[in-house]
């Protein structure tokens, strides 16, 4: 296409020195269209009489000759007004003007649709000097026209601060229809009407549209572009395209697939990412979405224990990120897990069920009847308790954790003992005398540490006291017993 710019072209000098070759007195007539040898473009000349100056933009020079005769008005000569040609063909057109020799530095520039054109390889200016005037022919050529070359071309000449403008030359590039809007692929609901749009332009106009569905024409009579096809509804996938016809021939749009929305396929590859005592993290690969985006997914969980009541827990989640943590499960239990996802049409079938297990849980109950008493002879605190009633799912008891906090006027410290599961008593060394010792005990399984028992406090006197009664877990409602005798 043509380079467009708004800056001034470099002026051609009016007398550029000796012309290449000899000056011809019988030079080409001013309104001929010089062509490359052998090239005959299709031209449509305007009906204006050749050779006569037009009455458009005319400059009346104020300068007079030696004989004081006023100079004639300056104007571009009429040339062809409208050129029609096919895409990719070449074209050459020109402007011509005779300029009195008294003018120097005349500039001719080409303009298209109001913008100056630059590109010396397109424009050539030739000078034919005579005694009083110089004939100037400005030619413009395009080797392979495109649709973007369509438009109105003019020549402009600046002379004596006046601007002379030629009549426009309209270039019309014709070709096969060109699509400005093609039908788009769509996903539609079964038996629901939808529209497809097709628009194409020339020149030449008019452009007529035929619609094609699965290789068969839909409309017997063409419609003028633009055309909207209303499809009353489909029951199965179809491919649509449109044909655009003009006098130059036919262009076919891309074929677009119209899909029928359906329920999704079930998810696949449900897998266990992580398991804890009370939760299972699962992931899945979504199935085919049925040409409609997934909205959400449902995780179905049922106890795999044959003795369970068979009830199904349902957890709803968003479709992304194909990951869900199932919570509030029993410890050390087996579950069957399936995933189903939905789109606007409905729910998929459930994925293949997978088996998953939770791990051992921490004990849910603290040791009972905690009793603490001071054994002065050995300077120890003896602690006794009852094993908590553990549920099967809490896992196997592996031991106990004993927290003992020592508080006196000068110190406060907490120590932690971990003891094995055998027996239900422990002995800890007295850390501080004249202090309060607060004891808490928790049961431990491989699943974790259970809750601590309620605190039991005992006062450890200074050395020399005689009798010590035990402290024990308070009865409900009595907090912080301190039994000192």
């Amino acid at each position: 296409a043509i380079t467009e710019a708004r800056e001034e072209a470099k002026p051609y000098p009016l007398f550029p020195g000796p012309f290449p070759g000899s000056l011809q007195t019988d030079h080409t007539p001013l309104l001929s269209l010089p062509h490359a040898s052998g090239y005959q473009p299709a031209l449509m000349f305007s009906p204006t009489q050749p050779g006569r100056p037009h009455t458009g933009n005319v400059a009346i020079p104020q300068v007079t000759s030696v004989e004081s005769k006023p100079l004639p008005p300056l104007a571009f000569k009429h040339t062809v007004g409208h050129i029609i040609l096919s895409e990719h063909k070449g074209v050459k057109f020109n402007c011509s003007i005779s300029v009195p020799n008294i003018y120097q530095d005349t500039t001719i520039s080409w303009w298209k649709d109001g913008k100056e054109l630059l590109g010396a390889h397109h424009a050539i200016t030739q000078f034919y000097p005579d005694d009083e005037v110089t004939a100037i022919i400005a030619s413009f050529s395009i080797t392979s026209v495109q649709r973007s070359d369509n438009g109105s071309y003019i020549c402009k000449m600046k002379i004596n601060n006046e601007e002379i403008v030629s009549d426009p030359i309209y270039i019309e590039v014709q070709g096969l229809p060109h699509f400005t809007k093609q039908p788009e692929s769509m996903n539609v609901t079964r038996n629901t009407a939808f529209n497809l749009t097709c628009q194409a332009v020339g020149p030449p106009e008019p452009v007529n549209i035929f619609w094609v569905q699965n290789s068969s024409r839909v409309n017997e009579q063409p419609e003028k572009s633009p055309s909207v096809l209303t499809v009353p509804g489909l029951t199965e996938m179809a491919v649509f395209s449109c044909e655009a016809h003009n006098d130059k021939g036919l262009t076919v749009s891309k074929g677009v697939q119209i899909n029928i929305k359906a329920i999704p396929s079930p998810p696949t590859e449900v897998s266990i990412r992580n398991s804890t005592a009370h939760s299972i993290l699962i992931s899945w690969v979504p199935g085919f979405d049925g040409y409609s985006p997934f909205r959400n997914c449902s995780i179905q969980v049922k106890e795999a224990d044959p003795l369970s009541n068979g009830s199904v827990m349902i957890f709803n989640t968003s479709a992304l990120p194909h990951l869900y943590q199932i919570k509030q499960l029993q410890a050390l239990a087996n579950y069957s897990i399936g995933v189903s996802c939905m789109n606007e049409i409905g729910w998929s079938a459930v994925s293949p069920w997978i088996l998953a297990s939770t791990t051992e849980g921490a004990p849910s109950v603290a040791p009972l009847n905690v009793t603490v008493f001071l054994n002065e002879s050995s300077d120890n605190v003896d602690i006794r308790w009852m094993k908590p009633p553990t549920k099967q799912q809490d896992g196997e008891l592996v031991g106990y954790r004993i927290s003992h906090v020592w508080q006196s006027a000068g110190i406060s410290k907490e120590l932690l003992e971990e003891v094995g599961q055998n027996g239900s008593r422990a002995r800890i060394s007295v850390q501080v005398h004249n202090a309060t010792c607060t004891v808490r005990i928790a049961a431990v399984t491989r699943g974790g540490v259970g809750p601590f028992s309620d605190p039991v406090k005992i006062f450890i006197p200074a050395h020399g006291w005689v009798d010590y009664a035990p402290s024990s877990t308070p009865a409900p409602g009595n907090a912080d017993p301190v039994l000192i005798i």
Partner: antibody, heavy 118, light 108 residues
Framework: QVQLRQSGPGLVQPSQSLSITCTVS????????LHWVRQSPGKGLEWLGV???????DYNAAFISRLSIIKDNSRSQVFFKMNSLQADDTAIYYC????????????WGQGTSVTVSS | QIVLTQSPPIMSAFLGERVTMTCTAS???????LHWYRQMPGSSPKLWIY???NLASGVPARFSGSGSGTSYSLTISSMEAEDAATYYC?????????FGGGTKLEIK
Amino acid sequence: QVQLRQSGPGLVQPSQSLSITCTVSGFSLSNYGLHWVRQSPGKGLEWLGVIWSGGITDYNAAFISRLSIIKDNSRSQVFFKMNSLQADDTAIYYCARKGHDPYAMDFWGQGTSVTVSS
Amino acid sequence: QIVLTQSPPIMSAFLGERVTMTCTASSSVSSSYLHWYRQMPGSSPKLWIYDTSNLASGVPARFSGSGSGTSYSLTISSMEAEDAATYYCHQYHHSPYTFGGGTKLEIK
């Protein structure tokens, strides 16, 4: 008086790890345990883990695979490290002393605001 | 894990008004391990009531706490301006230790 001072980065890249140091004064870590808790607009306050006075650690099962708490009693410092952070780990992270009486989190650090973003 | 549900999530009271907020546990919690924290905007939580009913150091006597099993409450006998804050209940009994979602108390 009892003080817990936290230091750590404000911005962490996704999949990277977070390290926060809690430096304590006014008490000894050999006598007291130290908890870590975080607070986010979406999930509220969440307990993450504890290091007891003797160095035993307990972690929230939801974080056990990517959490580590260690301490240096002589320097009065507890080091918290969480791996593989994602956007939903954006929160304010707190250290808090485990009291004796009250047997609760009785003193808290000032918090470290952590944003996980690339 | 034990879920603590606080209600109401947001409440407003006139100065001098009596205010009660509740905390319900999904499983039984020993009263020795149920605590309340108060948090002012931009600050860390602060221990406010421990072992269900004991006031932490420096807490005004107009605050009180009660409850057992799965139902606990915090009461302010006469609302004052400085009491506007968010209050969280916390169970330190069953691991993982959990917090309620908070009750935001505002002045009417």
